[in-house]
């Protein structure tokens, strides 16, 4: 299911890099979040819960990422013009059931001011 454009600020620029914010509802306990650049999987983070509510975080395609109870942030560094593209947060929800897949995204514009050491 494609939900379309993110209705929040998805890209946060700092120090020549960008933080891409992928939100999810805090009720979601087990999920996979992928960051897609166009159709290519750049990053992959899976959160599962085992017995005794032990949390497991796995990444098949590793990126510098940060997990909170309602978002996953992926960080891209050393921005250049080739980074300009459509980026999508592809969320697969395992718990609570039923299984759901949602895709939200936006276009990352690269401006000269964001390429080198700019804090925005």
């Amino acid at each position: 299911e494609i939900n379309g454009s993110a209705n929040y600020e998805m890209f946060i620029f700092h120090n020549g890099g960008v933080q891409i914010l992928c939100k999810y509802p805090d009720i979601v306990q087990q999920f996979k979040m992928q960051l897609l650049k166009g159709g290519q999987i750049l990053c992959d983070l899976t959160k599962t819960k085992g017995s005794g509510n032990t949390v497991s975080i796995k990444s098949l395609k590793f990126c510098h990422s940060q997990l909170s109870n309602n978002s996953v942030s992926f960080f891209l560094y050393n921005l250049d013009h080739s980074h300009a593209n459509y980026y999508f947060c592809n969320l697969s929800i395992f718990d609570p059931p039923p299984f759901k897949v949602t895709l939200t995204g936006g276009y990352l514009h690269i401006y000269e001011s964001q390429l080198c050491c700019q804090l925005k």
Partner: antibody, heavy 125, light 109 residues
Framework: EVQLVESGGGLVQPGGSLRLSCAAS????????MHWVRQATGKGLEWVST???????YYPGSVKGRFTISRENAKNSLYLQMNSLRAGDTAIYYC???????????????????WGQGTTVTVSS | EIVLTQSPGTLSLSPGERATLSCRAS???????LAWYQQKPGQAPRLLIY???GRATGIPARFSGSGSGTDFTLTISRLEPEDFAVYYC??????????FGQGTKLEIK
């Protein structure tokens, strides 16, 4: 008009099989979770099965291994294959739809908002 | 497994009175996944309330839902003759995926 119409009910002997169908119209079938719920005469509602938008399936212990839910989005159709039927499976079988919407921080379940009129299944020798 | 217990089993009231129906879960249920249905004899159930408190399309304002955790309530502020029916609560998104309460019959006193 949004509508669900069940068919395929009837009289079957214990141990027999039956396939129920539910024809959907008036909405985008593929974007909804679909359910079978049954009700024995004079009794309450009992959840039988659910199929998600990705084809994922769910059953209670009472029917697991005997019943199979499936969907054919191209035909706007929902099915319930019932095998090894027992007298306790005798009931009116309803199909129903529901939607779960996830967007950003929001997660909303909108309930089973459309139901069919039901089809009667009788298991008896 | 989450079990929903509704009370009372039967509620006898007169038109114009206020009805309060209870649904108690054996373990915590997210309010997102709690719904209420009305069923009249010979008819399919009708969705009244979703998300514990959201009124479904076309449902009169006299119907309201509340609660969280394990205790949920359906209130009918002023009973109309057509409100006498059986009411079911339902949970979703847990184990099992879906379950219904046993129902409360609202009858005319």
């Amino acid at each position: 008009e949004v509508q669900l119409v069940e068919s395929g009910g009837g009289l079957v002997q214990p141990g027999g099989s039956l396939r129920l169908s539910c024809a959907a119209s008036g909405f985008t079938f593929s974007t909804y979770e679909m359910h079978w719920v049954r009700q024995a005469t004079g009794k309450g509602l009992e959840w039988v099965s659910t199929i998600g938008t990705a084809g994922d399936t769910y059953y209670p212990g009472s029917v697991k291994g005997r019943f199979t839910i499936s969907r054919e989005n191209a035909k706007n159709s929902l099915y319930l294959q019932m095998n090894s039927l027992r007298a306790g499976d005798t009931a009116i079988y309803y199909c129903a739809r529901s939607s779960t919407v996830v967007s950003g921080y929001r997660y909303d379940y909108y309930g089973m908002d459309v139901w069919g009129q039901g089809t009667t299944v009788t298991v008896s020798s | 497994e989450i079990v929903l217990t509704q009370s009372p089993g039967t509620l006898s009231l007169s038109p114009g009175e206020r009805a309060t129906l209870s649904c108690r879960a054996s373990q915590s249920v997210s309010s997102i996944f709690l719904a209420w249905y009305q069923q009249k004899p010979g008819q399919a159930p009708r969705l009244l309330i979703y998300g514990a408190s959201g009124r479904a399309t076309g449902i009169p304002a006299r119907f309201s839902g509340s609660g969280s955790g394990t205790d949920f309530t359906l209130t009918i502020s002023r009973l109309e003759p057509e409100d006498f029916a059986v009411y079911y609560c339902q949970q979703y998104g847990s184990s099992p995926l879906c379950s219904f309460g046993q129902g409360t019959k609202l009858e005319i006193k």
